[in-house]
C-alpha cells in the first residue's frame, strides 16, 4: 500500500477549494492541525479541516444527494405529470362531447324536451366529471336521477301533451312510477353497468397516475439521515482534509455507502414494479364497457333508445300511470 | 334511429396526432404511457448505482479513496469502508425506511390492490339480456368496431377513436375548448455538474 502523500504544508489548496463552498476563509486552518475535535473525517495525522468545515461538508453532501435524486427522476417525473394532465384534460373533453352529443340528440329528435333535458343532461355529466376526479358520488344514483328527472318531462311533453307542465304533484308521482313500472325497460340498468364500470376504471387510472407523482416527489425530496450525511462526507470530502484533492472514491466503496444511505428507498422497488405491471394490466382491460370514451360517447344513442322504448309502450303506460297518479292529476285539473 | 352527431374532433393540444392516417386515440396514448413507464421498472433498484455513476468515482485511476486512506483501486481495502468505530453500516440498513417512505409504500400497496381488483379478465363481453321482454343488443364481434348495446335499429357503433385535431362546434351552445395546460419542462443543464465538486482539479 503506498504511503499517503504529506499534507499540504499550508492548507492552501484546501482553502481555495473550500472557498467555493463557503466564501470567507475563517474556517480553514492556515497550516495542518491535530483535528482532535473532528467527528467524521478522523485524522491519521495533521489535517486541514476544522469542525465547522466538517459541518459544511455534511450539508453539501446531503444537498448533492438530493440534487442527484432529482436529476435521476427528472424524466420519469415529467412523463407521469404530463400524462396525468393530458388524460385528465382528455377525459374532461370526452365528457363534454358526450354531453354535447346527448344534447344534440334531444335537439334533433325531441325538440320539445330540450330546455329541461339540457338541464338534466348537464347535471348528469357534471356529476360524471366530479366522479372521475374522485368525488364521493354514487353512479347508480346519478343515472337514476337522470331518468327520474327526464320521465316527467317525457310524460307531460311527449306522451300526454295535454297536461299542464307546472304541477309539482304529478312530477313526484311520475318520478316514483318511473322506477316502479320500469318505464325505460332495462336501459337505466344497462347504463348504470356501463357507466359505473368505465368510470371506476378511469377514476382509478387517474388516481394511480397521481400516486405515481407522489411516489416520485417523496423520493425526490427525501431528507437523508445524519448517519448517511456522515458517510457521504467521509466518501466525498474527507480526502480533501489530507490535501488529496485529485483522488476520487473507490467504486465499490461508493456502492456500499449508497446501499446504506438508500436502503429504505430501495424497499420501494418491489411495490414500484408491481405498480407498473398492475397499471399495464388495467390499461389492457380498458376496452368496450371498461373504456369511458367508448361508453360515454355512445350514451346519447342508448338514451335515445330508452325514450323510443317508452314511446313504444306509451299506450299501456299512460293507462297505468293515469290510474296510479290519478289523485295528483285531479288536483292539477281543478 | 338516433340522430348521430358528426365525427368527434378534439383539440390537438391535448393529444397530438401520431400519424395523420392513423389518428391517436386515448387507448393508444395509454399504451404509449405504459411502454415508457416500463422502461423505469428498475428505477428504484438502480438508484444507488445511478448516484455513484453521477458522482466523482475513480474509474481509470490506479489509486482511490476508501473513506480513510488512499488505496489501490483493486485492493480489498478499496471496497471496505473506512468507518471503524464510527457507526455501523449494517445498523443503518436495519433502521428501516423513513416514515415518509413507509407511508408511500403503504399507498403503493393499496393502489396495487385496487388496480388488481379492477383489472378485468380479457374477452369479457357485456350481458345481452336487457330486459324481460327479450329485446337484445346486436352482437359486437371481435373484428367489428366496439359498440354499445342498444335496442334493435337504434343500436349504433361507436368508433373508439378520438381525433385530436380540432374542437367540434355544434349548432347548439357548447363549452369552450380547454386552455393549454402548462407543462413542466426541465431547466437547461439542470444538475449537469456535481455540486461544487466536479471541476476542482
Amino acid at each position: 500500500q503506498p504511503p499517503p502523500p504529506p499534507p499540504d504544508a499550508t492548507c492552501h489548496q484546501v482553502r481555495s477549494f473550500f472557498q467555493r463552498l463557503q466564501p470567507g476563509l475563517k474556517w480553514v486552518p492556515e497550516t495542518p492541525v491535530p483535528g482532535s475535535d473532528l467527528q467524521v473525517c478522523l485524522p491519521k495525522g495533521p489535517t486541514c479541516c476544522s469542525r465547522k468545515m466538517e459541518e459544511k461538508y455534511q450539508l453539501t453532501a446531503r444537498l448533492n444527494m438530493e440534487q442527484l435524486l432529482q436529476s435521476a427522476s427528472m424524466e420519469l417525473k415529467f412523463l407521469i405529470i404530463q400524462n396525468a394532465a393530458v388524460f385528465q384534460e382528455a377525459f374532461e373533453i370526452v365528457v363534454r362531447h358526450a354531453k354535447n352529443y346527448t344534447n344534440a340528440m334531444f335537439k334533433n329528435n325531441y325538440p320539445s324536451l330540450t330546455p329541461q333535458a339540457f338541464e338534466f343532461v348537464g347535471e348528469f355529466f357534471t356529476d360524471v366529471s366530479l366522479y372521475i376526479l374522485g368525488s364521493d358520488i354514487n353512479v347508480d344514483d346519478m343515472v337514476n336521477e337522470l331518468f327520474d328527472s327526464l320521465f316527467p318531462v317525457i310524460y307531460t311533453q311527449l306522451m300526454n301533451p295535454g297536461l299542464p307542465d307546472s304541477a309539482l304533484d304529478i312530477n313526484e308521482c311520475l318520478r316514483g312510477a318511473r322506477r316502479d313500472l320500469k318505464v325505460f325497460g332495462n336501459f337505466p340498468k344497462l347504463i348504470m353497468t356501463q357507466v359505473s364500470k368505465s368510470l371506476q376504471v378511469t377514476r382509478i387510472f387517474l388516481q394511480a397516475l397521481n400516486l405515481g407523482i407522489e411516489v416520485i416527489n417523496t423520493t425526490d425530496h427525501l431528507k437523508f439521515s445524519k448517519d448517511c450525511g456522515r458517510m457521504l462526507t467521509r466518501m466525498w470530502y474527507c480526502s480533501y482534509c489530507q490535501g488529496l484533492m485529485m483522488v476520487k472514491p473507490c467504486g465499490g466503496y461508493c456502492n456500499v455507502v449508497m446501499q446504506g444511505c438508500m436502503a429504505g428507498v430501495v424497499e420501494i422497488d418491489k411495490y414500484w414494479r408491481e405498480y407498473i405491471l398492475s397499471l399495464e394490466e388495467l390499461v389492457n382491460g380498458m376496452y368496450r364497457i371498461y373504456d369511458m370514451e367508448n361508453v360515454l360517447l355512445g350514451l346519447f344513442s342508448t338514451i335515445h333508445d330508452s325514450i323510443q322504448y317508452v314511446q313504444k309502450n306509451a299506450g299501456k303506460l299512460t293507462t297505468t300511470i293515469g290510474k296510479l297518479c290519478a289523485h295528483s292529476q285531479q288536483r292539477q285539473y281543478r | 334511429s338516433a340522430y348521430y352527431p358528426e365525427d368527434l374532433f378534439i383539440d390537438k393540444k391535448v393529444l397530438k396526432v401520431a400519424h395523420v392516417e392513423h389518428e391517436e386515440t386515448l387507448s393508444s396514448r395509454r399504451r404509449e404511457l405504459i411502454q415508457k413507464l416500463k422502461s423505469f421498472i428498475s428505477f428504484y433498484s438502480a438508484l444507488p448505482g445511478y448516484i455513484c455513476s453521477h458522482s466523482p468515482v475513480a474509474e481509470n485511476d490506479t489509486l482511490c479513496w476508501n473513506g480513510q486512506e488512499l488505496v489501490e483501486r483493486y485492493s480489498q481495502k478499496a471496497a471496505r469502508n473506512g468507518m471503524k468505530n464510527q457507526f455501523n453500516l449494517h445498523e443503518l440498513k436495519m433502521k428501516g425506511p423513513e416514515p415518509v417512505v413507509s407511508q408511500i409504500i403503504d399507498k403503493l400497496k393499496h393502489i396495487n390492490q385496487l388496480l388488481r381488483t379492477m383489472s378485468m379478465p380479457k374477452g369479457r363481453v357485456l350481458d345481452k339480456n336487457l330486459d324481460e321482454e327479450g329485446f337484445e343488443s346486436g352482437d359486437c364481434g371481435d373484428d367489428e368496431d366496439e359498440c354499445i348495446g342498444g335496442s334493435g335499429d337504434g343500436m349504433i357503433k361507436v368508433k373508439n377513436q378520438l381525433r385530436f385535431l380540432a374542437e367540434l362546434a355544434y349548432d347548439l351552445d357548447v363549452d369552450d375548448a380547454p386552455g393549454n395546460s402548462q407543462q413542466a419542462t426541465p431547466k437547461d443543464n439542470e444538475i449537469s455538474t456535481f455540486h461544487n465538486l466536479g471541476n476542482v482539479h
Partner: antibody
C-alpha cells in the same frame, strides 16, 4: 460495467435469413428494453424495434415488421434479431442498444454487426 | 413518423472553439430528445438525454437545450477526441427517429 457484445460480421447470399446476437452483461437483463437500429452505408440511423425481456413483449417499426424478428434467451441474457428474405437493401450495420432505468432513451449500445448481402 | 431535421450536415471547427448543432422536430416532442456521439467502428455513445441531462462521465463541455420542436446541442472548448458524427434522437413517439447526423471535422 454495462456491456452489449454483438456477434461478428456476416456475408450472406440473397434469399434466406440471418440471425445476429447481442449478449449483455453488467445489468439485470430483464429490467431493460433492448432496441435494434440499422445504419446503411453512409446513411443515418433507423429504428427497427424493441423487445422487453421482462415479459417478452415486442414493438416494431412498421417498415421492418415483415423483415425483422426479435427474440430473447433470458438464461444467457442475449437478444437476437433475425432478418429474412435478404436483399442488397439489407446490407448495413445493425446495432443493439439498451434503454431504461432513468430514461427511455437508448443509453448503451453494442459495437454493431455488419451484414453484407451479396451474390 | 416524427421527422428530425438536423443541421448542419457537416461542420469544421478549431480546437478550443465552440460548435452548435440543431435539431427541429416535425411536431412538439416534449423535451424527449437525446444526443449521441458516433465514431467509426463503434456503437453510438449517449451524451445527453431529456434535452439537457448529461450522462455520467460526459464532460460539462457538452450541453443541450431547447423545447417544443427546436433543440440544440453545443460543445465548447473543442478537443481532438470530439471529432465524430453527432446524431439527435426523438423518443417522444414510440417510433423512435434520428436526425441525419452532423459530421464534425477539425479546421
Amino acid at each position: 460495467e454495462v456491456q452489449l457484445q454483438q456477434s461478428g460480421p456476416v456475408m450472406v447470399k440473397p434469399g434466406p435469413s440471418v440471425k445476429i446476437s447481442c449478449q449483455t452483461s453488467g445489468f439485470t437483463f430483464t429490467d431493460y428494453y433492448i432496441h435494434w437500429v440499422k445504419q446503411s452505408h453512409g446513411k443515418s440511423l433507423e429504428w427497427i424495434g424493441l423487445v422487453f425481456p421482462y415479459d417478452g413483449g415486442t414493438n416494431y417499426n412498421q417498415k421492418f415488421k415483415d423483415k425483422a424478428t426479435l427474440t430473447l434467451d433470458t438464461s444467457s441474457s442475449t437478444a437476437y434479431m433475425e432478418l429474412n428474405s435478404l436483399t442488397s437493401e439489407d446490407s448495413a450495420v445493425y446495432y443493439c442498444a439498451r434503454a431504461g432505468g432513468f430514461s427511455y432513451a437508448l443509453n448503451y449500445w453494442g459495437q454493431g454487426t455488419s451484414v453484407t448481402v451479396s451474390s | 413518423d416524427i421527422q428530425m431535421t438536423q443541421s448542419p450536415s457537416s461542420l469544421s471547427a478549431s480546437l478550443g472553439g465552440k460548435v452548435t448543432i440543431t435539431c427541429k422536430a416535425s411536431q412538439d416532442i416534449n423535451n424527449y430528445i437525446a444526443w449521441y456521439q458516433h465514431k467509426p467502428g463503434k456503437g453510438p455513445r449517449l451524451l445527453i438525454h431529456f434535452t439537457s441531462t448529461l450522462q455520467p462521465g460526459i464532460p460539462s463541455r457538452f450541453s443541450g437545450s431547447g423545447s417544443g420542436r427546436d433543440y440544440s446541442f453545443s460543445i465548447s472548448n473543442l478537443e481532438p477526441e470530439d471529432i465524430a458524427t453527432y446524431y439527435c434522437l426523438q423518443y417522444d413517439n414510440l417510433l423512435l427517429t434520428f436526425g441525419a447526423g452532423t459530421k464534425l471535422e477539425l479546421k
